[in-house]
Interface confidence: medium
């Protein structure tokens, strides 16, 4: 039987998912938004270039049944943070800088806690990373970090760091104070100068990666990578039912393919017998479970285990 066709944000789709008695609950995260905006949120080009895999020996590593990087490294505040990519297909950059921020803190034993700038990566990586707000390649984002480095930069108008994000969060809901979410907007310009009043200089503020690599699509290898080195960037195919995620362990039920989406994977566990990855999204805290979601683990669901990339910070 073919699956019924629903408008991506309709009550009918919410009801359909919830009546299926699946492992997750649907609800409304977006009300007042264009379809072009929703498609643009999914700004990751899947199946792009992959860096070499890092050789890992996981046989002797005792992996726990559940793991949450927020609890493992409580002294690293970025692990708990949810960002907002705004009206821009910059998820490929957000997944990278979020995981990089976490790893810098983890690998320096919290001596360096910095919000790495999504703006710097989005605007300065250029065509090597893809097409800015129109989508990009996660692997190339990590490669840019090792070659050119990334400066610090917090959320929109936070005045945190050298280059905070310049694209405002947009309003997912009917009555709200933020600008409406649209599918338009150019990629901001690459500016190699920190915002006024920030010291040190742009080049001085660069944080570099020592290396970057693919993680194999083995569930155990991904778990070992997170357990040993911190959160990773992953990417998967988003269907319209995912937009409605509220709680539980997401697995695709119905809906049209929206595009590729990059995220940060920070842990795993089992909920009511269903194994999951714990994931941070970049659609603000009013989406999903306070900005986070869980997705089926171990079956390469929607390709979640096929595009995992990571890297080690330089700490010298």
């Amino acid at each position: 039987r073919s699956r019924p066709s629903f408008h991506p944000l309709s009550d009918e789709l919410v009801n359909y998912v919830n009546k299926r008695n699946t492992t997750w609950q649907a609800g409304h995260n977006f009300y007042n938004v264009d379809m072009s905006y929703l498609k643009r949120l999914c700004g990751t080009f899947l199946g792009g270039p992959k860096p070499p895999q890092r050789v890992m020996f996981t046989e002797d590593l005792k992996l726990p049944a559940s793991f949450d990087a927020r609890e493992q490294w409580p002294q690293c505040p970025t692990i708990k943070e949810i960002r907002d990519q705004g009206s821009c297909g910059s998820c490929w950059a957000f997944g990278a800088v979020e995981a990089i921020s976490d790893r810098i803190c983890i690998h320096t034993n919290a001596h360096v806690s910095v919000e790495v700038s999504a703006e710097d990566l989005l605007t300065c990586c250029g065509s090597m990373c893809g097409d800015g707000c129109n989508g990009g390649y996660p692997a190339e984002a990590w490669n840019f970090w090792t070659r050119k480095g990334l400066v610090s930069g917090g959320l929109y108008e936070s005045h945190v760091g050298c280059r905070p994000y310049s694209i405002p969060p947009c309003e997912h809901h009917v009555n709200g104070s933020r600008p409406p979410c649209t599918g338009e907007g150019d990629t901001p310009k690459c500016s190699k100068i920190c915002e006024p009043g920030y010291s040190p200089t742009y080049k001085q503020d660069k944080h570099y990666g020592y290396n970057s690599y693919s993680v194999s699509n083995s569930e155990k290898d991904i778990m070992a990578e997170i357990y040993k080195n911190g959160p990773v960037e992953g990417a998967f195919s988003v269907y319209s039912d995912f937009l409605l995620y509220k709680s539980g362990v997401y697995q695709h039920v119905t809906g049209e393919m929206m595009g590729g989406h990059a995220i940060r994977i920070l842990g795993w566990g089992v909920e009511n017998g269903t194994p999951y990855w714990l994931v941070a999204n970049s659609w603000n805290t009013d989406w999903g479970d306070n900005g986070f979601f869980k997705i089926l683990r171990g079956q390469d669901h929607c390709g979640i285990e096929s595009e995992v990339v990571a890297g080690i910070p330089r700490t010298d």
Partner: antibody, heavy 119, light 112 residues
Framework: QVQLQQSGAELVRSGASIKLSCTAS????????MHWVKQRPEQGLEWIGW????????EYAPKFRGKATMTADTSSKTAYLQLSSLTSEDTAVYYC????????????WGQGTSVTVSS | DIVMTQTPLTLSVTIGQPASISCKSS???????????LNWLLQRPGQSPKRLIY???KLDSGVPDRFTGSGSGTDFTLKISRVEAEDLGVYYC?????????FGGGTKLEIK
């Protein structure tokens, strides 16, 4: 061989302007900030400012705003310092200093240019 | 502006003996990225300055390991384990954490 070659000594009249040059060899100035530092006779060092030759961004110490203007030409790998409305207070040796930040820190100094302002 | 205060003004040392120069800043030089932008320079007589140490304690290439930089926050020290004749000159500390960058007044090392 890496070096910064600065222009020769200058004797200028009070009220005049002067433009000093600093030419790099053996490295690409686009990867560096070019700083300028002032040293008055028998005194310490004062930071004037920096220019990023890659994009022309500049930062001046407040004391030197209006007095100093930094420019750079990447094709000739040369940085310039222009000093205007010269007075005896501007009599000093001026050094250019190329600094690369990050994990491959480098720091090169020119030999200095002596500027004497006469009334 | 950040004031950098160096002591002593002059230091007379016998060759082969240790030497220590202190530099105090009027505000902490520890930056939010965990780095301390404190450099030490040496200006030999009649020459341009040369950087010896950057980021508090990292030695520039070619600088002998008898030089060490240490300290944290507002108090910094440059130590020379065994002074050699080529070490004479004026030593400056300089901070790059706060704008504008500022230098210490200098410490003249002379050989006894």
């Amino acid at each position: 061989q890496v070096q910064l070659q600065q222009s020769g000594a200058e004797l200028v009249r009070s009220g005049a302007s002067i433009k000093l040059s600093c030419t790099a060899s053996g490295f690409n100035i686009k990867d560096y900030y070019m700083h300028w530092v002032k040293q008055r006779p028998e005194q310490g060092l004062e930071w004037i400012g920096w220019i990023d030759p890659e994009n022309g961004d500049t930062e001046y110490a407040p004391k030197f705003r209006g007095k100093a203007t930094m420019t750079a030409d990447t094709s000739s790998k040369t940085a310039y310092l222009q000093l205007s409305s010269l007075t005896s207070e501007d009599t000093a040796v001026y050094y250019c200093n190329a600094r690369r930040h990050g994990y491959y820190e480098m720091d090169y100094w020119g030999q200095g240019t002596s500027v004497t302002v006469s009334s | 502006d950040i004031v950098m205060t160096q002591t002593p003004l002059t230091l007379s040392v016998t060759i082969g003996q240790p030497a220590s120069i202190s530099c105090k800043s009027s505000q902490s030089l520890l930056y939010s990225n965990g780095k301390t932008y404190l450099n030490w320079l040496l200006q030999r007589p009649g020459q341009s300055p040369k950087r010896l140490i950057y980021l508090l304690s990292k030695l520039d290439s070619g600088v002998p390991d008898r030089f060490t930089g240490s300290g944290s926050g507002t108090d910094f020290t440059l130590k020379i384990s065994r002074v050699e004749a080529e070490d004479l000159g004026v030593y400056y500390c300089v901070q790059g954490t706060h704008f504008p960058y500022t230098f210490g007044g200098g410490t003249k090392l002379e050989i006894k």
